[in-house]
Amino acid sequence: MAVTACQGLGFVVSLIGIAGIIAATCMDQWSTQDLYNNPVTAVFNYQGLWRSCVRESSGFTECRGYFTLLGLPAMLQAVRALMIVGIVLGAIGLLVSIFALKCIRIGSMEDSAKANMTLTSGIMFIVSGLCAIAGVSVFANMLVTNFWMSTANMYTGMGGMVQTVQTRYTFGAALFVGWVAGGLTLIGGVMMCIACRGLAPEETNYKAVSYHASGHSVAYKPGGFKASTGFGSNTKNKKIYDGGARTEDEVQSYPSKHDYV
């Protein structure tokens, strides 16, 4: 039960995270005009990865796309790339994890396949989350650098007569959305990896041994022994009887060639 919960929760957390990464990537508020210690302007500027916008005091908003590829800063291109890679990996991870979910039955898919898929999706989510966090952090660093550069020469002009106030930009809402979303995707990925360990079918030592009792001949099925795999290991190799009901997350022993003597 715990494995299913961990896997399901990991999936949901990653799903929310990836939705957040997509939202952050599409948002226009990656950087917003710094209003602190600035003259009160009737115009508010904010910028995204794909376009820059201006909102006037009248409520009129005008956005202009960055229609050039070569003219854009390399850092912005890098951030775009990181976010897109994060989205693509996350989307593939979600697709893989849907089929890996224990609660979904697809034909006669074995637990080992589901475990592998869970691990794959988990790694994808981790990388996706890291891409988003890296992208947002690179952009934030770029903003901080530009902020202090523009603060250093806040006022430029001719002989001090005419002043030009440089627009300074600070962190926009998209950065926080991106950081949180990246973190959630990362956590979701870790949860999927943890769930994978519980899903992995344990290696069974298939050494069929016949024990001849004095009276009747009884063949013990090696499938009833819990092999030592490292997770919940049964080192004493005690016989585990299948008399009681089992939860879905307990390691199931599927029929093997040795089960039928």
Epitope: P39, A42, V54, E56, S58, V162
Partner: antibody
Framework: DVQLVESGGGLVQPGGSRKLSCGAS????????MHWVRQAPEKGLEWVAY????????HYADIVKGRFTVSRDNPRNTLFLQMTSLGSEDTAIYYC????????????WGQGTSVTVSS | DIVMTQSPSFLTVTAGEKVTMSCRSS????????????LTWYQHKPGQSPKLLIY???TRESGVPDRFTGSGSGTTFTLTISSVQPEDLAVFYC?????????FGSGTKLEIR
Amino acid sequence: DVQLVESGGGLVQPGGSRKLSCGASGFTFSSFGMHWVRQAPEKGLEWVAYISSDSSTKHYADIVKGRFTVSRDNPRNTLFLQMTSLGSEDTAIYYCARLRRGGNALDYWGQGTSVTVSS
Amino acid sequence: DIVMTQSPSFLTVTAGEKVTMSCRSSQSLLNSGNQRNYLTWYQHKPGQSPKLLIYWASTRESGVPDRFTGSGSGTTFTLTISSVQPEDLAVFYCQNNYYFPFTFGSGTKLEIR
């Protein structure tokens, strides 16, 4: 057709108060920011105050700050300018004007209402 | 506050003549975000309400004759009337629409000879 009609002007004693109104019609009043502009006799235009469409933002000229208050009643399509501690320098024709969507310009103006501060 | 300086204060011209008036601001009215200049020109005829002529420094308001042209960027702006008509007798004001307070220039009075 967009129409702005000011009212409430008249003769006021120095130190007195007055409340000007501006009735709007022909447009969705609640969607537009509004301004008050005045013109003293034989002088140029002087910007007085601004109020955003939802009343969340207000700005005033330094000369009227603390004495004048701009407000609006969107359901009644009316803009107000409450003036207190009036002095002779406040004698002017007061215009209300609508803020254009795009350009931050004042695209429609009322005919103005005259306020005279005198003893 | 932003100081708007208009020149000349008075202009006397004959009908059909080309006229140019200027407006200077103490700070740049150019917004880097959209590369627009937040400067507006108004025409105030005697006994009437002011009328919007040009916004964003060079965009003509609908219904305004094309003889009125706005130009300039940053801190220096110009209003040009290509062929003055008798009905153009008015005071022309420039206004800063970028910073609060929205200060006006002192105006340029146009008189027809």
